[in-house]
């Protein structure tokens, strides 16, 4: 059985992640009254390539059959929410598009796509923009997240 933990993520500007529509995550500042809108992730510890500082994880949305995945769209690595069969997921051997290398430095987390090395789960400086897969070449986008555990 795969081991999972529930958590919330905020970007380096303390923007929370919320579900916009069915298949899109957006990052925005929430106030105390609507903090419950932020998504709770189920972080599953899955099989992946051996590395001292990278831990392979899959990121599902708690209570939904949705997982973050990385695919090529219009010749560009793209982050999407993908619907899965709840009877088969999560599993220890997740397909590579679902796998992110969790990199942790002093309580800050980065999530690198296993499918597309050097591409990271990213947020924009701008409010209410979609969470996306970025290669951080511009330097403006945010790839560091803080994590808060949530009771299962």
């Amino acid at each position: 059985a795969v081991r999972s933990l529930h958590c919330r993520l905020q970007d380096a500007q303390q923007k929370s992640l919320v579900l916009s529509g069915t298949y899109e995550l957006k990052a925005l500042h929430l106030n105390a009254e609507n903090l419950n809108q932020q998504v709770v992730f189920s972080m599953s510890f899955v099989q992946g390539e051996e590395s001292n500082d990278k831990i392979p994880v899959a990121l599902g949305l708690r209570g939904k059959n949705l997982y973050l995945s990385c695919v090529m769209k219009d010749d560009k690595p793209t982050l999407q929410l993908e619907s899965v069969d709840p009877n088969r997921y999560p599993k220890k051997k997740m397909e590579k598009r679902f796998v992110f290398n969790k990199i942790e430095i002093k309580d800050k987390l980065e999530f690198e796509s296993a499918q597309f090395p050097n591409w990271y789960i990213s947020t924009s400086q701008t409010e209410y923009m979609p969470v996306f897969l970025g290669n951080n070449s511009g330097g403006q986008d945010l790839i560091d997240f803080s994590m808060e555990f949530v009771s299962s």
């Epitope: 059985a1 081991r3 933990l5 529930h6 510890f45 099989q47 051996e50 831990i55 994880v57 220890k92 969790k102 942790e104 309580d107 555990f149 949530v150 009771s151 299962s152």
Partner: antibody, heavy 120, light 107 residues
Framework: QVQLVQSGAEVKKPGASVKVSCKVS????????IEWVRQAPGKGLEWIGE????????NYNEKFKGKATITADTSTDTAYMELSSLRSEDTAVYYC?????????????WGQGTLVTVSS | DIQMTQSPSSLSASVGDRVTITCKAS??????LSWFQQKPGKAPKSLIY???RLVDGVPSRFSGSASGTDYTLTISSLQPEDFATYYC?????????FGQGTKLEIK
């Protein structure tokens, strides 16, 4: 540096309960599982269960469900394991240990152990 | 439960010897395998995690390897302080399970 300091030895009568503590320092308490392991006299090591103080998640060895209750107090960075309905076969040294929340680092640090003796 | 079959149960060796201790897992444990050293009256000491990663401060004469579901701890050149009991642990599936232990004694 990381330290796990356990409570002192206990002598209990059969049927009684005992609560063993494990006070940690030197790391972020909420981010590490606290593991509990027992070792009966002259025997090997046996895993009892674990708690992640950051969210209260607990996993037990089925063998110890109903025997052991694991808790954690984040205000004092202390984990506890209570053993109930003690019998002579519960006589053992009980250890706490730690593992990072993502399970990558193994049971790196250990407490000094707490000897629980059950005798009438 | 996953069984960890550790061998040998005891081993006599001399200072300077190369020794190997093996644990066989009853199923795949995805490299979640640690080795511990324990001396009488003391808590276990972590040596190796994730099959081959050395814990900080552990001498390089200790090493770990894997072949399928067989896991090996090797001490390349025994030192007097290495005589102790060694345990493996799988922490991939609940309940986590230890090997029965290998007592390493002076020949």
């Amino acid at each position: 540096q990381v330290q796990l300091v356990q409570s002192g030895a206990e002598v209990k009568k059969p049927g009684a309960s005992v609560k063993v503590s494990c006070k940690v320092s030197g790391y972020t308490f909420s981010r590490y599982w606290i593991e509990w392991v027992r070792q009966a006299p002259g025997k090997g090591l046996e895993w009892i269960g674990e708690i992640l103080p950051g969210n209260g998640n607990i996993n037990y060895n089925e063998k110890f469900k109903g025997k052991a209750t694991i808790t954690a107090d984040t205000s004092t960075d202390t984990a506890y394991m209570e053993l109930s309905s003690l019998r002579s076969e519960d006589t053992a040294v009980y250890y706490c240990s730690t593992i990072y929340y993502d399970y990558d680092q193994g049971f790196t640090y250990w407490g000094q152990g707490t000897l629980v003796t059950v005798s009438s | 439960d996953i069984q960890m079959t550790q061998s040998p149960s005891s081993l006599s060796a001399s200072v300077g010897d190369r020794v190997t201790i093996t644990c066989k897992a009853s199923q795949d444990i995805d490299r979640y395998l640690s080795w511990f050293q324990q001396k009488p009256g003391k808590a276990p000491k972590s040596l190796i995690y994730r099959v081959k990663r050395l814990v900080d401060g552990v001498p390089s004469r200790f090493s770990g390897s894997a072949s399928g579901t067989d896991y090996t701890l090797t001490i390349s050149s025994l030192q007097p302080e290495d005589f102790a009991t060694y345990y493996c642990l799988q922490y991939d599936e609940f309940p986590y399970t230890f090997g029965q232990g290998t007592k390493l004694e002076i020949k």
